[in-house]
């Protein structure tokens, strides 16, 4: 199966959404769990994650084309506690598949702003404020 994971972020006012997107075929969904970890370089797992999403096969989707499933983790107000290194991952023990996305970072600056770095994938950004920068 051709399956991959991407990371992205979007800003809505003071909120920052961290998004893990898994691209997969319809029939590959069952058994997968997508999860987002913080500051876990070697032991990112659903048990140690900030949030997890178990994928389900959607009988309403026809065909075998590539579809996407998203996990969204929302930070309502970014604070220094949110600084760190994040990673999107996915796993299916049923199929023996694990996917590890690129590491990306949130850095809270002394001026009260923050930056998100290391997002190499496509993004759809909605900036309402200039408090945050994504690069």
């Amino acid at each position: 199966g051709c399956i991959n994971i991407t990371s992205s972020a979007s800003q809505e006012g003071t909120r920052l959404n961290l998004i893990c997107t898994v691209w997969h075929k319809k029939e590959e969904a069952e058994g997968f769990v997508v999860f987002l970890c913080k500051d876990r370089s070697g032991d990112c797992s659903p048990e140690t994650s900030l949030k997890q999403l178990r994928l389900k096969r959607d009988p309403g989707i026809d065909g075998v084309g590539e579809i996407s499933s998203q996990l969204m983790f929302t930070i309502s107000q970014v604070t220094p506690l949110h600084s760190g290194t994040y990673q999107c991952c996915a796993r299916s023990q049923k199929s023996g598949i694990r996917l590890q996305g690129h590491f990306f970072s949130i850095l809270f600056t002394e001026t009260g702003n923050y930056t998100v770095t290391g997002l190499k994938q496509r993004q759809h950004l909605e900036f309402s404020h200039n408090e945050g920068t994504l690069s």
Epitope: I3, G31, E47, R54, Q93, K94, G96, I97, R98
Partner: antibody, heavy 112, light 107 residues
Framework: EVQLVESGPGLVQPSETLSLTCTVS????????VNWFRQPPGKGLEWMGT???????DYNSALKSRLSISRDTSKSQVFLKMNSLQTEDTAIYFC??????WGQGTLVTVSS | DIVMTQSPKSMSISVGDRVTMNCKAS??????IAWYQQKPGQSPKLLIY???NRYTGVPDRFTGSGSGTDFTLTITNMQTEDLAVYYC?????????FGGGTKLELK
């Protein structure tokens, strides 16, 4: 069609090393992972370890010190090596894609 | 390690019976449980994964339920081809561990 076939010696001497091969077809080892399981005759099942699609491995802690799982993706083969075999390692050894598709297994007897 | 305790160890049943077997985990394993059927001389066949998801091609008389520590496999309208040993597997924690099995025999 997904298939997994285990092969190796039927008889191993105590204290020697067991080498088994799992040859897969119908899928790529870079897309799916393989587990090894074993079952002593007439007894229950034991998980031994995993080699994930990305090549990473997880092992049963009870076997970790003497177990190694590797692969050759170009040959669609997964290898199990276990040293210091004892009679209690006599079992049918199975490989499986994830935990869904299983091979038929190969019987390994440890005896002098 | 997580200990999976299956009960009963064996059952004598008749064709058409409703059969229920249990698996108890020594710790919370969420829903990360699979059920297998194994017939003599064959490899285990996956029936249920994630506690209640029926695997492709498995007849709908097989149903899995439960979460946390207590799990059940139910066979409604038992058939002769269902005579086998059934194992539960937890895959929430390493090492993955199996129950000791439940053997179904004809009365």
């Amino acid at each position: 069609e997904v298939q997994l076939v285990e092969s190796g010696p039927g008889l191993v001497q105590p204290s020697e090393t067991l080498s088994l091969t799992c040859t897969v077809s119908g899928f790529s080892l870079t897309s799916y992972g393989v587990n090894w399981f074993r079952q002593p005759p007439g007894k229950g099942l034991e998980w031994m370890g995993t080699i994930w699609n990305d090549g990473g491995t997880d092992y049963n802690s009870a076997l970790k010190s003497r177990l190694s799982i590797s692969r050759d993706t170009s040959k669609s083969q997964v290898f199990l090596k276990m040293n210091s075999l004892q009679t209690e390692d006599t079992a049918i050894y199975f490989c499986a894609r994830g935990f869904e598709y299983w091979g038929q297994g190969t019987l390994v007897t440890v005896s002098s | 390690d997580i200990v999976m305790t299956q009960s009963p160890k064996s059952m004598s049943i008749s064709v058409g019976d409703r059969v229920t077997m249990n698996c108890k985990a020594s710790q919370n394993v969420g829903k990360n449980i699979a059920w297998y059927q194994q017939k003599p001389g064959q490899s285990p066949k996956l029936l249920i994964y994630y506690a209640s998801n029926r695997y492709t091609g498995v007849p709908d008389r097989f149903t899995g339920s439960g979460s946390g520590t207590d799990f059940t496999l139910t066979i409604t309208n038992m058939q002769t081809e269902d005579l086998a040993v059934y194992y539960c597997l937890q895959y929430n924690y390493n090492p993955w561990t199996f129950g000791g099995g439940t053997k179904l025999e004809l009365k």
